[in-house]
Amino acid sequence: FEIALPRESNITVLIKLGTPTLLAKPCYIVISKRHITMLSIKSGERIVFTFSCQSPENHFVIEIQKNIDCMSGPCPFGEVQLQPSTSLLPTLNRTFIWDVKAHKSIGLELQFSIPRLRQIGPGESCPDGVTHSISGRIDATVVRIGTFCSNGTVSRIKMQEGVKMALHLPWFHPRNVSGFSIANRSSIKRLCIIESVFEGEGSATLMSANYPEGFPEDELMTWQFVVPAHLRASVSFLNFNLSNCERKEERVEYYIPGSTTNPEVFKLEDKQPGNMAGNFNLSLQGCDQDAQSPGILRLQFQVLVQHPQNESNKIYVVDLSNERAMSLTIEPRPVKQSRKFVPGCFVCLESRTCSSNLTLTSGSKHKISFLCDDLTRLWMNVEKTISCTDHRYCQRKSYSLQVPSDILHLPVELHDFSWKLLVPKDRLSLVLVPAQKLQQHTHEKPCNTSFSYLVASAIPSQDLYFGSFCPGGSIKQIQVKQNISVTLRTFAPSFQQEASRQGLTVSFIPYFKEEGVFTVTPDTKSKVYLRTPNWDRGLPSLTSVSWNISVPRDQVACLTFFKERSGVVCQTGRAFMIIQEQRTRAEEIFSLDEDVLPKPSFHHHSFWVNISNCSPTSGKQLDLLFSVTLTPRTVDLT
């Protein structure tokens, strides 16, 4: 190889070892029979060299730096050339560096031809290996503007006082043009301006200078977004940190054409604007930091540009002014991320403050709209607390657990509506009475309705899940000892049509000691499957549950257990089951940790099944599944 650099070219070529590899054989640059690992060639020098190995690209990199001095004479503006031409260089990973020094009063503009640039964050890399690293200068301090790949939206970067541009090309890349030009501009009076151009729908992720380190103190950086008038842009902050300010306040300012309040000033922690039509500017302004504990200001944000949706012009009123202790969250439903561009899906408060999540609280009337291509990408989760603090006031009081119609009218699917039902400890218990009798979801007889009620203890230390229940069964009521959460969970969009089937009333009743009592009135037509709470994890230690099973006069009930033994092994105490006839009070007691479970038994009158657990050893839990089937009596035994 021969590299000859013209005099006065202000170019330096440096060949040096790249990142160390685990290659056993070393490789050298050989020059005049000398083996070296670094070679520096300056303007006016001509050097002939070879490599001592077959694949020098696995060992060495080449840096070509051109210093452009705009301080002492005219600046060579225009398209920037790759010098020396890549065809004259050894095939190594190469980095072309242009270091432009200029007066503080002179603005320098880097213009990128198509494809434009896409900024990448720390730890990311470019698919084709071609990266552009751009930095500026504040006095003697170097400021990293960012690292960029091809195929993005960044078309121009304006700076002043100097710019350093490094173009990294992998050894196999055929590129032989720089892809950018330099122009002079008047002073921009800030650190830099980045112009981002959208031709159509798309997104851009951008970062403050020096990201992920701190933005320079008391500096100003602006992003100019060029967006076709027929599209809408939304800004979301992906990541930010605030420094400790001594004077002034860190903020972002938007210049939005057509806004009567330009510039619109936002704190970084505010919801950022969405649904903006056409071009806009965003500026990040730092503050004077506390010298002792400066902290860092940094920002990573995304601009999403998409077509306005039909829904974006509709305003929905959610009236929660008469509600208490309630919150409604609209959020994205979990999905697998795809690699192609996905338009944003935002919910907007008062049409401007848009974000992917929105929580509305009780006590107010809210106006919301949607900026979303497909509203099935969102769902709603609601929480409401009904609590009783004074047992004398609450006793026998009833509340209807029903989804308010305002919520059902929203164009977003309801996922969960959770009622937290709180009672004074050891004073009151709760009874749930459904509008339509409930079926317990089991593997043997799964629920196939569009919604279910999930009933679980709401006591933090207690891991007790009573089960999932849907309309169309035999459970007439569920009594529970203490605080519970009842969650209406929907499984299909058809819930809207079936909403009339929902309806659950909760009443506060005198306190009882059992964890739960299920009142079951089987229908003659079907087999009722019942299972102990906390299925798969086992009934909690020392917990007692009962089923009150009604048997009509002309029927006989067959009680069947689905395994021979309960499988529970007690560490302390005993686990037992009592089957008690309600009329005669006759009872059978089974030791669940010793006896086999009873064979199918026939009951001519209503009866109780009570199951009480011991403290089981781990892995040997108490899980029971049983069924009740009614058949007509053939002989009247009365």
Epitope: P26, Y28, V30, I31, K33, R34, H35, I36, T37, M38, L39, S40, S52
Partner: antibody, heavy 114, light 111 residues
Framework: EVQLQESGAELARPGASVKLSCKAS????????MQWVKQRPGQGLEWIGA????????RYTQKFKGKATLTADKSSSTAYMQLSSLASEDSAVYYC???????WGQGTTLTVSS | NIVLTQSPASLAVSLGQRATISCRAS??????????MHWYQQKPGQPPKLLIY???NLESGVPARFSGSGSRTDFTLTIDPVEADDAATYYC?????????FGGGTKLEIK
């Protein structure tokens, strides 16, 4: 993997000559200097000289000019060092090594004794 | 001839501590922006083994506890932390100028 295989131990009379060999395998023999180093028992390392097999260029330390002659045979990737007019102070271990010295031979012990 | 002076001639270092060996050249061994100084380790009955080449490049397979630094006339080999297996004699060599020369060696003992 590069290996340098040196010839076996030599016993020679004073005044005689010996030719030590060093065969390189798995290496681009012509692209590296081959240097020879002497080490007497309990002593340090002493550079004798080097040869660039690509063009036969040789370098010697003053003390070994006339004592050592370095040659190389590209076809067999072998370097040779001939030591002449042997005296008892030539008794030592002689190493061949590439330069840069990533690879060393196991050493040849030369004993000069009457 | 370039004379290489190694110091100290011998050195005793406790296990886990740092060992520093110096090599001073009578004139600069730098050319083409490279320092033509190399460091070797030799144990009794074995050929020397390359540790560091061109002043600061770690030879493949050599633990990162070994490092080399310096330029022009002053060079240092550092072993940090020292292990029992590091007991050996260490040599520096320059090949910037004919004749190539070795330092006198430094014997490292582990306490």
């Amino acid at each position: 993997e590069v290996q340098l295989q040196e010839s076996g131990a030599e016993l020679a009379r004073p005044g005689a000559s010996v030719k030590l060999s060093c065969k390189a395998s798995g290496n681009t023999f012509t692209n590296y200097w081959m240097q020879w180093v002497k080490q007497r028992p309990g002593q340090g390392l002493e550079w004798i000289g080097a040869i660039y097999p690509g063009d036969g260029d040789t370098r010697y330390t003053q003390k070994f000019k006339g004592k050592a002659t370095l040659t190389a045979d590209k076809s067999s990737s072998t370097a040779y060092m001939q030591l002449s007019s042997l005296a008892s102070e030539d008794s030592a271990v002689y190493y061949c090594t590439t330069s840069p010295a990533h690879y060393w031979g196991q050493g040849t012990t030369l004993t000069v004794s009457s | 001839n370039i004379v290489l002076t190694q110091s100290p001639a011998s050195l005793a270092v406790s296990l886990g501590q740092r060992a520093t060996i110096s090599c001073r050249a009578s004139e600069s061994v730098d050319s083409y922006g490279n320092s033509f100084m190399h460091w070797y380790q030799q144990k009794p009955g074995q050929p020397p083994k390359l540790l560091i080449y061109l002043a600061s490049n770690l030879e493949s397979g050599v633990p990162a506890r070994f490092s080399g630094s310096g330029s022009r006339t002053d060079f240092t080999l550092t072993i940090d932390p020292v292990e029992a297996d590091d007991a050996a004699t260490y040599y520096c060599q320059q090949n910037n100028e004919d004749p190539w020369t070795f330092g006198g060696g430094t014997k490292l003992e582990i306490k």
